[in-house]
Amino acid sequence: CDLPQTHSLGNRRALILLAQMRRISPFSCLKDRHDFEFPQEEFDDKQFQKAQAISVLHEMIQQTFNLFSTKDSSAALDETLLDEFYIELDQQLNDLESCVMQEVGVIESPLMYEDSILAVRKYFQRITLYLTEKKYSSCAWEVVRAEIMRSFSLSINLQKRLKSKE
């Protein structure tokens, strides 16, 4: 399955929007820094089967969408930028969704797929619990925004690797 050219443009736009969402200096939030243990191994090559990689990317973006579409995020972040961000993520999801559906039944290792989906889910659980613990403070959102930028960049790198393998 070939992701459309607009997909990588959308990725870049989403990253730019995340960068623009910054409301306070990260330096004022150093005490709130947290290691969310990004599941790096799920984004390494490790004989990554394409069908599985696309499903993992889809899960990553779906969880990002859900994280940023809560009433708490609307209160903490710029609504106009959020709305634009939703549009980009929605497009990403549509692109990946059609790819996942084309590759349906192609996953060779269901157990590896389960582990990957669960690893991404747990990563976002850690982020969700962190925000809850910090009572959705502006610093907590700044830490999370920076973390999602990092994870988004890593997702983009995986997509580039998939493209170069075609």
């Epitope: 969880q63 859900n66 999801l93 969704e97 559906m101 659980q125 969700t128 619990l129």
Partner: antibody
């Protein structure tokens, strides 16, 4: 508000199949995995599997692999759980429950569908 | 598969008393993925506590959760008449997700 409405009770003969539906409303249907959990009379809860309504991929508990099929219809925001080769031990209330994270994990359940398997 | 064993199977107490329900896991469960549900006859389960110790929305403060590793506890500080029900612990730390067999809290 989030609502999950399930289909009505069913009576089936051993060896037959049953298909239970769960219609979702009050949220973006394709954004959350939907799970199926069953409960035999007077017994505990048992997780059967889950489906991502966005693309239809499924993860099933090993115990039900080969007998359960979860599908979805995005046009009606409905997920389905079909169980085949029914036996008397499959008599249970079947629930759909929405996934999520933190306080949203299984925070929303359908009302349950009683499936009775009897000859 | 992570087996969750709840004890006691039945707990008979009076309103106003303190209830302590246990959930023991066959192998270690990360506290972030341990949940508690309440179920009343003829109803679907209701989320009480998420991630071991966090109260779900609308749940009264008399409910609390604690624990780590393989041992988890649900405590109800002072029982109200509406608290008499079946309680389940649940883990989604690894597939397949599992539930305990339940503890029935009944009026003495």
């Amino acid at each position: 508000q989030v609502q999950l409405v399930q289909s009505g009770a069913e009576v089936k003969k051993p060896g037959a199949s049953v298909k239970v539906s769960c219609k979702a409303s009050g949220y973006t249907f394709t954004n959350y995995w939907m799970h199926w959990v069953r409960q035999a009379p007077g017994q505990g809860l048992e997780w059967m599997g889950e489906i991502n309504p966005s693309h239809g991929r499924t993860i099933y508990a090993q115990k039900f692999q080969g007998r359960v099929t979860m599908t979805r219809d995005t046009s009606t925001s409905t997920v389905y759980m079909e169980l085949s080769s029914l036996r008397s031990e499959d008599t249970a209330v079947y629930y759909c429950a929405r996934g999520g994270l933190g306080p949203a994990w299984f925070a929303y359940w359908g009302q349950g569908t009683l499936v009775t398997v009897s000859s | 598969e992570i087996v969750l064993t709840q004890s006691p199977a039945t707990l008979s107490l009076s309103p106003g008393e303190r209830a302590t329900l246990s959930c023991s896991a066959g192998s270690s469960v990360d506290s972030s993925y341990l949940y508690w549900y309440q179920q009343k006859p003829g109803q679907a389960p209701r989320l009480l506590i998420y991630s071991t110790s966090n109260l779900a929305s609308g749940i009264p403060a008399r409910f609390s959760g604690s624990g780590s590793g393989t041992d988890f506890t649900l405590t109800i500080s002072s029982l109200e008449p509406e608290d008499f029900a079946v309680y389940y612990c649940h883990q989604w730390s690894s597939y397949p997700f599992t539930f305990g067999q339940g503890t029935k809290l009944e009026i003495k």
